[in-house]
């Protein structure tokens, strides 16, 4: 194939719920991805695998299968949701996320995503990693790109 470009756009929404007894935070994070097919033929996106890390610990994973077919010289925007759980050794975060005295409870999460396309039995994988701010204290919808966290660890595209 000539090339398939994958661009992680950002967090679209984050919906939060809590388990008071277990001091656990549940975050359903919906992300947006742009996949561009620069070939002169259609390409099949076989699967998208994603995981979310908080403080170097994987807190959520997701996999979407048989996603879509992208036409030549075309782009498709795909949303995918990763259910995450902040619990156990990270239960100290429960206090921060439920603290009433602060308005925004932003935490920094690392979003990893891998897009797999299959070409006559040969798989091609394209991966992206991005750090993003997510509010763990309330349900939030974001303007695309609004949640981006820029630091020296995150290479600029």
């Amino acid at each position: 194939p000539r090339s398939i470009d994958v661009k992680y756009i950002g967090v679209k929404s984050a919906y939060v719920s809590y388990d008071v007894q277990k001091r656990t935070i549940y975050l359903n994070i919906t992300n947006t991805l742009n996949i561009t097919n620069n070939n002169y033929y259609s390409v099949e996106v076989e699967n998208i695998t994603a995981q979310v890390q908080f403080s170097k610990t994987v807190i959520g994973k997701a996999r979407l299968n048989n996603i879509t077919i992208i036409g030549p010289l075309d782009m498709k925007q795909i949303d995918y949701t990763v259910p995450t759980v902040i619990a156990e050794e990270m239960s100290y975060m429960y206090d921060f996320c439920t603290l009433i005295s602060i308005k925004v409870h932003n935490i920094v999460l690392m979003m990893q995503v891998t897009v797999t396309t299959t070409y006559f039995g040969h798989s091609e994988q394209i991966s992206q990693e991005r750090y993003q701010y997510v509010d763990c204290g309330r349900n939030t919808t974001y303007q695309l790109g609004q949640s981006e966290y820029l630091n020296v660890l995150q290479p600029q595209q």
């Epitope: 194939p1 000539r2 002169y40 033929y41 259609s42 390409v43 099949e44 077919i69 036409g71 030549p72 010289l73 075309d74 782009m75 070409y119 006559f120």
Partner: antibody, heavy 122, light 107 residues
Framework: QVQLQQSGAELIRPGTSVKVSCKAS????????IEWVKQRPGQGLEWIGV????????NYNEKFKGKAKLTADKSSSTAYMQLSSLTSEDSAVYFC???????????????WGQGTSVTVSS | DIQMTQSPSSLSASLGERVSLTCRAS??????LNWLQQEPDGTIKRLIY???SLDSGVPKRFSGSRSGSDYSLTISSLESEDFVDYYC?????????FGGGTKLEIK
């Protein structure tokens, strides 16, 4: 039947621009690519670029970047090629060509327009 | 860019004769090759796609084949309307590139 009807011959002054049209009929315009090819008098064929009329996505031969601009109007099933800053080197016949494709397969240039002659002269 | 070297550039032959035109690719193009025919009035039509598949409506006297990086168009028995120009086209990579053409003339 599939037809690609191109606009008529053009006589253009150097330094100006021209827009060549290619009206498609007999098939679903957005289900195929449209490519453009140049042929100078008595010479061979040269690929300019390609457009997906459905998405508007384009790709150009490096040689024609900045020279050619490809567009398409879905409502009229018409593809356009604009050539700018014309010189005598741009005097040629320009063809629009339909290309079919599938998933991981391409069968390009199955139907050709009749060609549009562009002459650049002062 | 992939170079397509087409030979001969011109060929004189007689009616009923069998002729072959060749294109050599500078890089591997698999079976991604077309043969095109151009009439004196400029009209172009595709004869063969994917190296050896005949387009609908094209006479069976035309055939395409491959041997390594050499691609051939063969006309088994020349008819009067075959004395025109022929081009090969590779579409394995961008930019698409054409052979220099073969002018088929009547002897």
């Amino acid at each position: 039947q599939v037809q690609l009807q191109q606009s008529g011959a053009e006589l253009i002054r150097p330094g100006t621009s021209v827009k060549v049209s290619c009206k498609a009929s007999g098939y679903a315009f957005t289900d195929y690519l449209i490519e453009w090819v140049k042929q100078r008098p008595g010479q061979g064929l040269e690929w300019i670029g390609v457009i997906n009329p459905g998405s508007g996505g384009t790709n150009y031969n490096e040689k024609f970047k900045g020279k050619a601009k490809l567009t398409a109007d879905k409502s009229s099933s018409t593809a356009y090629m604009q050539l700018s800053s014309l010189t005598s080197e741009d005097s040629a016949v320009y063809f629009c060509v339909r290309s079919s494709y599938g998933v991981y397969v391409a069968y390009p240039m199955d139907y050709w327009g009749q060609g549009t002659s562009v002459t650049v002269s002062s | 860019d992939i170079q397509m070297t087409q030979s001969p550039s011109s060929l004189s032959a007689s009616l009923g004769e069998r002729v072959s035109l060749t294109c050599r690719a500078s890089q591997d193009i698999g079976s991604n090759l077309n043969w095109l025919q151009q009439e004196p009035d400029g009209t172009i039509k595709r004869l063969i796609y994917a190296t050896s598949s005949l387009d609908s409506g094209v006479p069976k006297r035309f055939s395409g084949s491959r041997s390594g990086s050499d691609y051939s168009l063969t006309i088994s028995s020349l008819e009067s309307e075959d004395f025109v120009d022929y081009y090969c086209l590779q579409y394995a990579s961008s930019p698409r590139t054409f052979g220099g053409g073969t002018k088929l003339e009547i002897k």
